[in-house]
Interface confidence: medium
Amino acid sequence: QPDAINAPVTCCYNFTNRKISVQRLASYRRITSSKCPKEAVIFKTIVAKEICADPKQKWVQDSMDHLDKQTQTPKT
Protein backbone atom coordinates (compact mmCIF):
# COMPACT_ATOMS: atom_id res chain seq x y z
CA GLN A 1 0.00 0.00 0.00
CA PRO A 2 1.26 3.52 -0.74
CA ASP A 3 1.99 5.67 2.29
CA ALA A 4 1.02 9.37 2.35
CA ILE A 5 2.21 10.26 5.87
CA ASN A 6 4.19 13.14 4.44
CA ALA A 7 1.28 14.42 2.36
CA PRO A 8 1.11 15.53 -0.39
CA VAL A 9 4.05 13.20 -1.30
CA THR A 10 3.00 9.57 -1.63
CA CYS A 11 5.76 6.98 -1.38
CA CYS A 12 6.07 3.23 -1.72
CA TYR A 13 8.16 1.35 0.82
CA ASN A 14 7.36 -2.18 -0.32
CA PHE A 15 6.38 -3.68 -3.65
CA THR A 16 3.81 -6.33 -4.39
CA ASN A 17 5.45 -9.69 -4.99
CA ARG A 18 2.67 -11.02 -7.16
CA LYS A 19 1.80 -10.22 -10.73
CA ILE A 20 -1.56 -8.51 -11.23
CA SER A 21 -3.62 -9.31 -14.30
CA VAL A 22 -3.94 -6.31 -16.64
CA GLN A 23 -7.69 -6.92 -16.73
CA ARG A 24 -7.80 -5.86 -13.06
CA LEU A 25 -5.92 -2.60 -13.63
CA ALA A 26 -7.56 0.74 -14.33
CA SER A 27 -4.64 3.20 -14.27
CA TYR A 28 -1.20 3.88 -12.88
CA ARG A 29 0.99 6.72 -11.75
CA ARG A 30 4.74 6.92 -11.37
CA ILE A 31 6.45 7.88 -8.10
CA THR A 32 9.74 9.60 -8.87
CA SER A 33 10.00 12.11 -6.03
CA SER A 34 13.43 12.43 -4.44
CA LYS A 35 11.59 12.52 -1.11
CA CYS A 36 10.73 8.84 -1.58
CA PRO A 37 13.18 6.00 -0.87
CA LYS A 38 12.60 4.29 -4.21
CA GLU A 39 11.10 4.84 -7.63
CA ALA A 40 7.77 3.10 -7.89
CA VAL A 41 4.58 2.64 -9.83
CA ILE A 42 1.20 2.78 -8.12
CA PHE A 43 -1.45 0.82 -9.95
CA LYS A 44 -5.11 1.57 -9.29
CA THR A 45 -7.31 -1.49 -9.76
CA ILE A 46 -10.83 -1.53 -11.15
CA VAL A 47 -12.08 -1.69 -7.54
CA ALA A 48 -10.02 1.44 -6.70
CA LYS A 49 -7.38 -0.38 -4.65
CA GLU A 50 -3.87 1.10 -4.93
CA ILE A 51 -0.90 -1.24 -5.22
CA CYS A 52 2.81 -0.39 -5.22
CA ALA A 53 4.93 -2.13 -7.85
CA ASP A 54 8.56 -2.17 -8.95
CA PRO A 55 8.99 -0.33 -12.28
CA LYS A 56 12.06 -2.44 -13.10
CA GLN A 57 9.98 -5.63 -13.29
CA LYS A 58 8.84 -6.52 -16.76
CA TRP A 59 5.25 -7.37 -15.82
CA VAL A 60 4.96 -3.84 -14.40
CA GLN A 61 6.37 -2.32 -17.60
CA ASP A 62 4.08 -4.48 -19.73
CA SER A 63 1.06 -3.47 -17.64
CA MET A 64 1.94 0.22 -17.94
CA ASP A 65 2.46 -0.28 -21.66
CA HIS A 66 -0.94 -1.95 -21.97
CA LEU A 67 -2.68 0.87 -20.07
CA ASP A 68 -0.89 3.52 -22.14
CA LYS A 69 -1.85 1.91 -25.40
CA GLN A 70 -5.49 1.64 -24.33
CA THR A 71 -5.62 5.41 -24.03
CA GLN A 72 -3.21 6.40 -26.81
CA THR A 73 -4.25 4.76 -30.04
CA PRO A 74 -1.81 5.56 -32.86
CA LYS A 75 -3.20 7.76 -35.64
CA THR A 76 -4.13 5.90 -38.80
Epitope: K56, K58, Q61, M64, D65
Partner: antibody, heavy 117, light 107 residues
Framework: QVQLVQSGAEVKKPGSSVKVSCKAS????????MHWVRQAPGQGLEWMGR????????KFDPKFQGRVTITADTSTSTAYMELSSLRSEDTAVYYC??????????WGQGTTVTVSS | DIQMTQSPSSLSASVGDRVTITCKAF??????RAWYQQKPGKAPKLLIH???SLEHGVPSRFSGSGSGTDYTLTISSLQPEDFATYYC?????????FGGGTKVEIK
Protein backbone atom coordinates in the same frame (compact mmCIF):
# COMPACT_ATOMS: atom_id res chain seq x y z
CA GLN B 1 25.03 -2.61 -8.93
CA VAL B 2 23.94 -3.89 -12.33
CA GLN B 3 26.76 -5.09 -14.57
CA LEU B 4 26.65 -6.73 -17.98
CA VAL B 5 29.89 -8.40 -19.05
CA GLN B 6 30.24 -9.58 -22.64
CA SER B 7 32.50 -12.13 -24.28
CA GLY B 8 35.64 -11.10 -26.15
CA ALA B 9 36.27 -9.92 -29.70
CA GLU B 10 35.76 -12.34 -32.58
CA VAL B 11 37.11 -12.57 -36.13
CA LYS B 12 34.91 -14.62 -38.45
CA LYS B 13 34.84 -15.72 -42.06
CA PRO B 14 31.93 -14.76 -44.34
CA GLY B 15 29.17 -17.35 -44.21
CA SER B 16 30.04 -18.51 -40.69
CA SER B 17 28.24 -17.80 -37.39
CA VAL B 18 29.17 -15.97 -34.22
CA LYS B 19 27.77 -16.36 -30.72
CA VAL B 20 28.22 -13.52 -28.22
CA SER B 21 27.48 -13.93 -24.52
CA CYS B 22 26.38 -11.39 -21.93
CA LYS B 23 26.60 -12.27 -18.23
CA ALA B 24 24.48 -10.19 -15.87
CA SER B 25 25.12 -9.50 -12.23
CA UNK B 26 23.19 -7.32 -9.81
CA UNK B 27 19.86 -8.20 -11.41
CA UNK B 28 17.58 -11.17 -11.90
CA UNK B 29 17.44 -11.59 -15.67
CA UNK B 30 14.13 -13.44 -15.51
CA UNK B 31 12.57 -10.20 -14.23
CA UNK B 32 13.71 -8.12 -17.16
CA UNK B 33 14.14 -8.08 -20.93
CA MET B 34 17.56 -8.48 -22.49
CA HIS B 35 18.17 -6.70 -25.79
CA TRP B 36 20.90 -6.70 -28.42
CA VAL B 37 21.97 -3.57 -30.28
CA ARG B 38 24.78 -3.28 -32.81
CA GLN B 39 26.90 -0.45 -34.15
CA ALA B 40 28.89 -0.70 -37.38
CA PRO B 41 32.19 1.27 -37.49
CA GLY B 42 31.47 5.01 -37.61
CA GLN B 43 27.73 4.35 -37.81
CA GLY B 44 24.69 4.68 -35.59
CA LEU B 45 22.91 2.24 -33.30
CA GLU B 46 20.69 -0.54 -34.60
CA TRP B 47 18.31 -2.60 -32.44
CA MET B 48 18.42 -6.29 -33.32
CA GLY B 49 16.01 -7.95 -30.92
CA ARG B 50 15.23 -8.99 -27.38
CA UNK B 51 14.40 -11.97 -25.20
CA UNK B 52 12.17 -12.48 -22.20
CA UNK B 53 14.46 -14.89 -20.30
CA UNK B 54 11.54 -16.11 -18.20
CA UNK B 55 9.70 -17.80 -21.07
CA UNK B 56 12.22 -17.44 -23.93
CA UNK B 57 9.83 -15.32 -26.00
CA UNK B 58 11.81 -13.32 -28.54
CA LYS B 59 11.14 -10.33 -30.75
CA PHE B 60 13.39 -9.24 -33.63
CA ASP B 61 13.82 -6.48 -36.15
CA PRO B 62 12.46 -8.17 -39.31
CA LYS B 63 15.72 -7.41 -41.12
CA PHE B 64 17.46 -9.93 -38.82
CA GLN B 65 14.65 -12.47 -38.62
CA GLY B 66 15.88 -15.94 -39.52
CA ARG B 67 19.54 -14.98 -39.14
CA VAL B 68 19.67 -14.08 -35.46
CA THR B 69 18.97 -16.32 -32.47
CA ILE B 70 18.70 -14.88 -28.97
CA THR B 71 18.73 -17.24 -26.01
CA ALA B 72 19.12 -16.94 -22.26
CA ASP B 73 20.14 -19.18 -19.39
CA THR B 74 18.53 -17.95 -16.17
CA SER B 75 20.63 -20.35 -14.06
CA THR B 76 23.80 -18.50 -15.07
CA SER B 77 22.16 -15.08 -15.69
CA THR B 78 23.56 -15.11 -19.21
CA ALA B 79 22.01 -13.98 -22.49
CA TYR B 80 23.35 -15.03 -25.88
CA MET B 81 23.06 -13.66 -29.39
CA GLU B 82 24.00 -15.82 -32.36
CA LEU B 83 24.20 -14.33 -35.85
CA SER B 84 24.53 -16.69 -38.81
CA SER B 85 25.42 -16.33 -42.50
CA LEU B 86 27.84 -13.55 -41.64
CA ARG B 87 28.80 -10.98 -44.26
CA SER B 88 31.22 -8.06 -44.21
CA GLU B 89 28.36 -5.64 -43.37
CA ASP B 90 27.95 -7.50 -40.05
CA THR B 91 31.30 -6.15 -38.87
CA ALA B 92 30.24 -4.14 -35.83
CA VAL B 93 30.31 -3.78 -32.08
CA TYR B 94 27.49 -5.83 -30.56
CA TYR B 95 26.00 -4.67 -27.26
CA CYS B 96 23.66 -6.39 -24.86
CA UNK B 97 21.46 -4.11 -22.81
CA UNK B 98 18.87 -4.36 -20.07
CA UNK B 99 15.54 -3.13 -21.39
CA UNK B 100 13.01 -1.05 -19.51
CA UNK B 101 9.91 -0.78 -21.76
CA UNK B 102 12.01 -0.48 -24.89
CA UNK B 103 14.81 1.79 -23.77
CA UNK B 104 18.10 0.63 -22.32
CA UNK B 105 19.40 1.67 -18.93
CA UNK B 106 22.38 -0.69 -18.57
CA TRP B 107 24.70 -1.77 -21.37
CA GLY B 108 27.46 -4.32 -21.76
CA GLN B 109 30.91 -3.11 -22.73
CA GLY B 110 30.44 -4.30 -26.31
CA THR B 111 31.90 -7.15 -28.36
CA THR B 112 33.69 -6.40 -31.61
CA VAL B 113 32.88 -8.85 -34.38
CA THR B 114 35.00 -8.58 -37.53
CA VAL B 115 33.89 -10.46 -40.64
CA SER B 116 36.73 -10.85 -43.07
CA SER B 117 37.94 -13.42 -45.55
CA ASP C 1 9.38 0.76 -38.72
CA ILE C 2 9.20 4.24 -37.22
CA GLN C 3 11.99 6.31 -38.72
CA MET C 4 13.77 8.81 -36.47
CA THR C 5 15.48 11.77 -38.13
CA GLN C 6 17.99 13.60 -35.99
CA SER C 7 19.49 17.00 -36.67
CA PRO C 8 22.05 18.37 -36.95
CA SER C 9 24.35 15.44 -37.68
CA SER C 10 27.20 17.41 -36.10
CA LEU C 11 27.74 20.75 -34.42
CA SER C 12 30.62 22.74 -32.99
CA ALA C 13 30.15 24.53 -29.69
CA SER C 14 32.11 26.07 -26.86
CA VAL C 15 32.05 25.33 -23.15
CA GLY C 16 29.14 27.23 -21.61
CA ASP C 17 27.05 27.25 -24.81
CA ARG C 18 23.42 26.17 -24.88
CA VAL C 19 23.05 23.25 -27.28
CA THR C 20 19.85 21.93 -28.83
CA ILE C 21 19.48 18.67 -30.73
CA THR C 22 16.22 17.73 -32.42
CA CYS C 23 14.66 14.43 -33.35
CA LYS C 24 11.65 13.93 -35.60
CA ALA C 25 9.65 10.71 -35.66
CA PHE C 26 7.72 9.76 -38.79
CA UNK C 27 4.63 9.14 -36.66
CA UNK C 28 3.38 10.02 -33.18
CA UNK C 29 5.46 8.19 -30.55
CA UNK C 30 3.56 9.57 -27.54
CA UNK C 31 6.67 10.71 -25.65
CA UNK C 32 8.13 7.22 -25.85
CA ARG C 33 11.63 8.33 -26.63
CA ALA C 34 15.01 8.21 -24.99
CA TRP C 35 18.26 10.14 -25.39
CA TYR C 36 21.71 8.59 -25.06
CA GLN C 37 25.25 9.94 -24.89
CA GLN C 38 28.10 7.94 -26.39
CA LYS C 39 31.82 8.59 -26.16
CA PRO C 40 34.36 6.92 -28.50
CA GLY C 41 34.99 3.28 -27.66
CA LYS C 42 32.29 3.23 -24.98
CA ALA C 43 28.75 1.92 -24.73
CA PRO C 44 25.91 4.45 -24.93
CA LYS C 45 24.71 5.96 -21.66
CA LEU C 46 21.02 6.64 -21.01
CA LEU C 47 20.31 10.32 -20.28
CA ILE C 48 16.56 10.84 -20.57
CA HIS C 49 13.56 8.61 -21.11
CA UNK C 50 9.86 9.24 -21.54
CA UNK C 51 8.41 12.73 -21.30
CA UNK C 52 11.15 14.32 -19.17
CA SER C 53 12.59 11.63 -16.87
CA LEU C 54 16.28 12.30 -16.24
CA GLU C 55 18.15 9.08 -15.49
CA HIS C 56 19.71 8.87 -12.02
CA GLY C 57 23.08 10.63 -11.86
CA VAL C 58 22.58 12.65 -15.05
CA PRO C 59 23.28 16.37 -14.50
CA SER C 60 20.29 18.72 -14.54
CA ARG C 61 21.82 20.73 -17.42
CA PHE C 62 20.38 17.98 -19.66
CA SER C 63 16.68 18.26 -20.40
CA GLY C 64 14.21 16.80 -22.83
CA SER C 65 11.07 18.27 -24.29
CA GLY C 66 8.59 17.73 -27.10
CA SER C 67 5.50 15.74 -27.95
CA GLY C 68 3.88 13.99 -30.87
CA THR C 69 6.57 13.62 -33.51
CA ASP C 70 9.02 16.35 -32.49
CA TYR C 71 11.48 16.06 -29.60
CA THR C 72 14.44 18.06 -28.35
CA LEU C 73 17.47 17.44 -26.16
CA THR C 74 18.90 20.59 -24.60
CA ILE C 75 22.20 21.01 -22.79
CA SER C 76 21.81 24.32 -20.96
CA SER C 77 25.51 25.00 -20.43
CA LEU C 78 27.91 22.71 -22.26
CA GLN C 79 30.69 21.23 -20.12
CA PRO C 80 33.99 19.70 -21.31
CA GLU C 81 32.72 16.18 -20.53
CA ASP C 82 29.65 16.70 -22.75
CA PHE C 83 31.58 16.51 -26.02
CA ALA C 84 30.24 13.25 -27.41
CA THR C 85 27.69 11.80 -29.84
CA TYR C 86 24.01 11.89 -28.87
CA TYR C 87 21.28 9.56 -30.09
CA CYS C 88 17.52 9.66 -29.81
CA UNK C 89 15.49 6.44 -29.81
CA UNK C 90 11.79 5.66 -30.00
CA UNK C 91 10.27 2.90 -27.89
CA UNK C 92 6.64 3.33 -28.88
CA UNK C 93 6.76 0.22 -31.04
CA UNK C 94 9.20 -2.48 -32.08
CA UNK C 95 11.44 -2.54 -33.96
CA UNK C 96 12.89 0.16 -31.71
CA UNK C 97 14.74 2.68 -33.84
CA PHE C 98 17.46 5.27 -33.27
CA GLY C 99 18.21 8.60 -34.85
CA GLY C 100 21.40 8.87 -36.87
CA GLY C 101 23.28 10.66 -34.08
CA THR C 102 24.59 14.17 -33.44
CA LYS C 103 28.29 14.64 -32.83
CA VAL C 104 28.99 17.58 -30.51
CA GLU C 105 32.51 18.84 -31.11
CA ILE C 106 34.68 21.54 -29.57
CA LYS C 107 34.65 24.81 -31.50
Amino acid sequence: QVQLVQSGAEVKKPGSSVKVSCKASGLTISHTYMHWVRQAPGQGLEWMGRIDPDNHNTKFDPKFQGRVTITADTSTSTAYMELSSLRSEDTAVYYCARGVFGFFDHWGQGTTVTVSS
Amino acid sequence: DIQMTQSPSSLSASVGDRVTITCKAFEDIYNRRAWYQQKPGKAPKLLIHGATSLEHGVPSRFSGSGSGTDYTLTISSLQPEDFATYYCQQFWSAPYTFGGGTKVEIK
